[in-house]
C-alpha cells in the first residue's frame, strides 16, 4: 500500500462524493453532496492534509423535514403555526388596513417524495386597496411640512417639523392610508412654544418693555 496518500473515503448514504479520483495525495479536495430532500450535516468539503489525514470528519446526509422561512410580506403581519416550519406547518399572512392580499393567504409546508419539503404556494403580495390620494395638510403654525404637495398618493408619508423655540405636539410623521377614500393616519401636529420666554423671544419682544404683562405672567407661573 502507498504511504503518500490519504485513506480512501467511503460513499455516504443518500449522497455522493466528487471528484472520485484515485490519487488522494495531499492537497486533494473531496466534496460530499446529498440527494434532493437531504442536507449535509458536518463539513461537505474534506482536504487531504500534509500528515495524510483528512481535515474533517466524514459528513452525513440527513432528511430535510422542514420548509425554509417563506419570509415577511410588506404591509402584512403573519401568523406562524410552528417556529421552525416542519412539514404540516402553516403561515398565514394578513394585510394591513388599506391593503389587499393577492395570492394565497395561507401557505402549508408539504412533504415531497423526492426533494425537500415545499410550501404550497409562493408568498402573497399586499397591494394598495385604492389609488385615491389624500389632500395636502397645511403646515402647522411656526412649523413646516415635507413634501409640500397638494395631493399625496396613497401610501405616502409626510413629515412635520417646528421652528426653533417650538416643540412638536402630535405625530412627526403621518401616512396617507389607502381606503374608500384614502385618509391620513393621524391628525396634523401643532407646534407649541418650548417655553414662555421662547414664545416672546421668537417674536423679538422685549419683555422688559412690558412690565405689566411680565408681572402678570409671573403671577401665572
Amino acid at each position: 500500500p502507498r504511504n503518500d496518500t490519504c485513506p480512501e473515503l467511503p460513499e455516504i448514504p443518500n449522497g455522493w462524493k466528487s471528484p472520485s479520483q484515485p490519487e488522494l495525495v495531499h492537497g486533494t479536495v473531496v466534496t460530499y453532496q446529498c440527494y434532493p430532500g437531504y442536507q449535509v450535516v458536518g463539513s461537505s468539503v474534506l482536504m487531504c492534509q500534509w500528515d495524510l489525514t483528512w481535515s474533517e470528519d466524514l459528513p452525513s446526509c440527513q432528511r430535510v423535514t422542514s420548509c425554509h422561512d417563506p419570509g415577511d410580506v410588506e404591509h402584512s403581519r403573519r401568523l406562524i403555526s410552528s417556529p421552525k416550519f416542519p412539514v404540516g406547518a402553516t403561515v398565514q399572512y394578513i394585510c394591513d388596513q388599506g391593503f389587499v392580499l393577492m395570492g394565497s393567504s395561507i401557505l402549508t409546508c408539504h412533504d415531497r417524495q423526492a426533494g425537500s419539503p415545499k410550501w404550497s404556494d409562493r408568498a402573497p403580495k399586499c397591494l394598495l386597496e385604492q389609488l385615491k390620494p389624500c389632500h395636502g395638510l397645511s403646515a402647522p403654525e411656526n412649523g413646516a411640512r415635507s413634501p409640500e404637495k397638494q395631493l399625496h398618493p396613497a401610501g405616502a408619508t409626510i413629515h412635520f417639523s417646528c421652528a426653533p423655540g417650538y416643540v412638536l405636539k402630535g405625530q412627526a410623521s403621518i401616512k396617507c392610508v389607502p381606503g374608500h377614500p384614502s385618509h391620513w393616519s393621524d391628525p396634523p401636529p401643532i407646534c407649541r412654544a418650548a417655553s414662555l420666554d421662547g414664545f416672546y423671544n421668537s417674536r423679538s419682544l422685549d419683555v422688559a418693555k412690558a412690565p405689566a404683562a411680565s408681572s402678570t405672567l409671573d403671577a401665572a407661573h
Partner: antibody, heavy 118, light 112 residues
C-alpha cells in the same frame, strides 16, 4: 390624472421576439403596494392577463405563458416593459398595460396591436 | 384557473330598455379577506376596456348610476337600467380573488 400608453413593433414574423413598452404618468411604481400589468386581447381567447410587476420588482406571470414572458420596469422613467419570445400567429392581439391595485385593473392604456405573419 | 362564463354572448336591446348580463365562476371567488373581487368592464369599439364595477357592486368613479352589479359566491349580474347609445360595446366580467386573474368571454350589447 393616471394615463398609460403602450408601444410596440406592429408586425412580427413567427419565431421573432416581441418587445413592448408601457409609459405611464399620474402615479409612481415606487409607491409601496403599486403594480402594473400586461393584458392582451386575442380573437381566440379574448382578454388574457399576462404578467404583473410590483413596486418591489417582484414579478408574477400567467403560468400558461411563463416560459416565454419577461416583465421589467424602469421606475425613474415611469416605464414597464414586456418581452414575449418565439411569437406565433396565436400571439396576434392587442396588448394593453394597466394599473393593478385593489385586485382590479382601474386604468388601461389605449393598446398596441401586434400582427404575427410570415 | 378560475373559469368565468358569461351569458348571453350577444344581447340585442332597444334604447331605453333594461339589460341584464350574467357571469358565473367555476368556483367561489370569495377572497380570504371576505370580499369578492368581481369586476365588470366595458370595451367600446376602438377603445380599451374601462372599469365599471368593482367588488361586485361598487361603481368606479364617473360611472353613471344606471349601471349596477349584484351577486355572490359564483353567480353575478350586471344590470343597465336604461340603455343609452354610449353603452354599446362588449362587457367583460373579471375575477381578481385568485391567481391568475381571469376574464369572462364577453357579452356584446347591440341595438335590436
Amino acid at each position: 390624472q393616471v394615463t398609460l400608453k403602450e408601444s410596440g413593433p406592429g408586425i412580427l414574423q413567427p419565431s421573432q421576439t416581441l418587445s413592448l413598452t408601457c409609459s405611464f404618468s399620474g402615479f409612481s411604481l415606487s409607491t409601496s403596494g403599486m403594480g402594473v400589468s400586461w393584458i392582451r386581447k386575442t380573437s381566440g381567447k379574448g382578454l388574457e392577463w399576462l404578467a404583473h410587476i410590483f413596486w418591489d420588482d417582484d414579478k408574477w406571470y400567467n403560468p400558461s405563458l411563463k416560459s416565454r414572458l419577461t416583465i421589467s420596469k424602469a421606475t425613474s422613467s415611469n416605464q414597464v416593459f414586456l418581452i414575449l419570445t418565439s411569437v406565433d400567429t396565436a400571439d396576434t392581439a392587442t396588448y394593453y398595460c394597466a394599473t393593478f391595485y385593489g385586485l382590479y385593473f382601474a386604468y388601461w392604456g389605449q393598446g398596441t396591436t401586434l400582427t404575427v405573419s410570415s | 384557473d378560475v373559469v368565468m362564463t358569461q351569458s348571453p354572448l350577444s344581447l340585442p336591446v332597444s334604447l331605453g330598455d333594461q339589460a341584464s348580463i350574467s357571469c358565473r365562476s367555476s368556483q367561489s371567488i370569495v377572497h380570504s379577506n371576505g370580499n369578492t373581487y368581481l369586476e365588470w368592464y366595458l370595451q367600446k369599439p376602438g377603445q380599451s376596456p374601462k372599469l365599471l364595477i368593482y367588488k361586485v357592486s361598487n361603481r368606479f368613479s364617473g360611472v353613471p348610476d344606471r349601471f349596477s352589479g349584484s351577486g355572490s359566491g359564483t353567480d353575478f349580474t350586471l344590470k343597465i337600467s336604461r340603455v343609452e347609445a354610449e353603452d354599446l360595446g362588449v362587457y367583460y366580467c373579471f375575477q381578481g380573488s385568485h391567481v391568475p386573474p381571469t376574464f369572462g368571454g364577453g357579452t356584446k350589447l347591440e341595438i335590436k
